[in-house]
Amino acid sequence: CKAMHVAQPAVVLASSRGIASFVCEYASPGKATEVRVTVLRQADSQVTEVCAATYMMGNELTFLDDSICTGTSSGNQVNLTIQGLRAMDTGLYICKVELMYPPPYYLGIGNGTQIYVIDPEPCPDSDF
């Protein structure tokens, strides 16, 4: 019996508008009906929660209204989008998947996606 595996891309480049999207996919060892997906940022040895959402299998993923994340789910695959990123937010973003219900609970974490964010150059003043 293999442990739950979570896959995510190694590298993603954020758009010029500070938006980064990636897929988090997991191989489930059980028939979960309730799944929690958390995005965590690891900088040095510090790990901080970026956003989290719980969803019922077959239903949509809903983050809190003030979250910087949005996402959609399809089976064992979650499409995650993080918005409002700036150059200082460049770092390793880890996808954590928890099978919450029914018991038993299972935990899986991906190896992390290195998100690179480049602040756009300010537009030069136009002389007319």
């Epitope: 293999k2 442990a3 309730e34 929690r36 965590l40 928890e98 919450m100 219900y101 609970y105 935990l107």
Partner: antibody, heavy 119, light 107 residues
């Protein structure tokens, strides 16, 4: 800094009830799974129960299922363990523990509170 | 449920000895394996998490290895303060079982 302080232990007769509390501080309480772990005198560590995040999901060891109830009040940063139908074999030091946000390890433990079930 | 076994259950060693404790899970737990040290009358203390990561403030003579079902805790040169009980624990799936413990005492 992270602090976990248990209270509510004591001596109780078999079949009676007791409620343990754990006051947490120094971290965002609702972002963490919170656990109870116990240790009978001279014995090893035994995981008792966990409650996740918003309190909707709870899991128990078979030895306490149906008798113990774990709960949390995120507005008060407090974890509880309601223990009913207590037995002599529930005699132990009960520890409140915070699971790590990433891999679930127990990096922070309370000082423990002793529960003695005896007639 | 995942069962955790530990060996040996106790061992006698001398200061300076290299000590190895093994832990086995009844099924794969990936790297969700943690090691704790406990001294009499005290709460357990985390030594190693995620199979091989050293907890901040823990001396580098402690190390962990393994993945899947087989794990090892090694103390490279036993110090007087290391005489204690050691427990492994899995944080992969409920119930989050501990191993039965290994007591390390003075030879």
């Amino acid at each position: 800094q992270v602090q976990l302080v248990e209270s509510g232990g004591g001596v109780v007769q078999p079949g009676r009830s007791l409620r343990l509390s754990c006051a947490a501080s120094g971290f965002t309480f609702n972002s963490y799974g919170m656990h109870w772990v116990r240790q009978a005198p001279g014995k090893g560590l035994e995981w008792v129960a966990v409650i996740w995040y918003d309190g909707n999901n709870k899991h128990y060891a078979d030895s306490v299922k149906g008798r113990f109830t774990i709960s949390r009040d995120n507005s008060k940063n407090t974890l509880y363990l309601q223990m009913n139908s207590l037995r002599a074999e529930d005699t132990a030091v009960y520890y409140c523990v915070r699971g790590d946000i990433l891999t679930g390890y127990y990096g922070y433990w309370g000082q423990g509170t002793l529960v003695t079930v005896s007639s | 449920d995942i069962q955790m076994t530990q060996s040996p259950s106790s061992l006698s060693a001398s200061v300076g000895d290299r000590v190895t404790i093994t832990c086995r899970a009844s099924q794969s737990i990936s790297s969700f394996l943690n090691w704790y040290q406990q001294k009499p009358g005290k709460a357990p203390k985390l030594l190693i998490y995620a199979a091989s990561s050293l907890q901040s403030g823990v001396p580098s003579r402690f190390s962990g290895s393994g993945s899947g079902t087989d794990f090892t805790l090694t103390i490279s040169s036993l110090q007087p303060e290391d005489f204690a009980a050691y427990y492994c624990q899995q944080s992969y799936s409920t119930p989050f079982a501990f191993g039965p413990g290994t007591k390390v005492d003075i030879k």
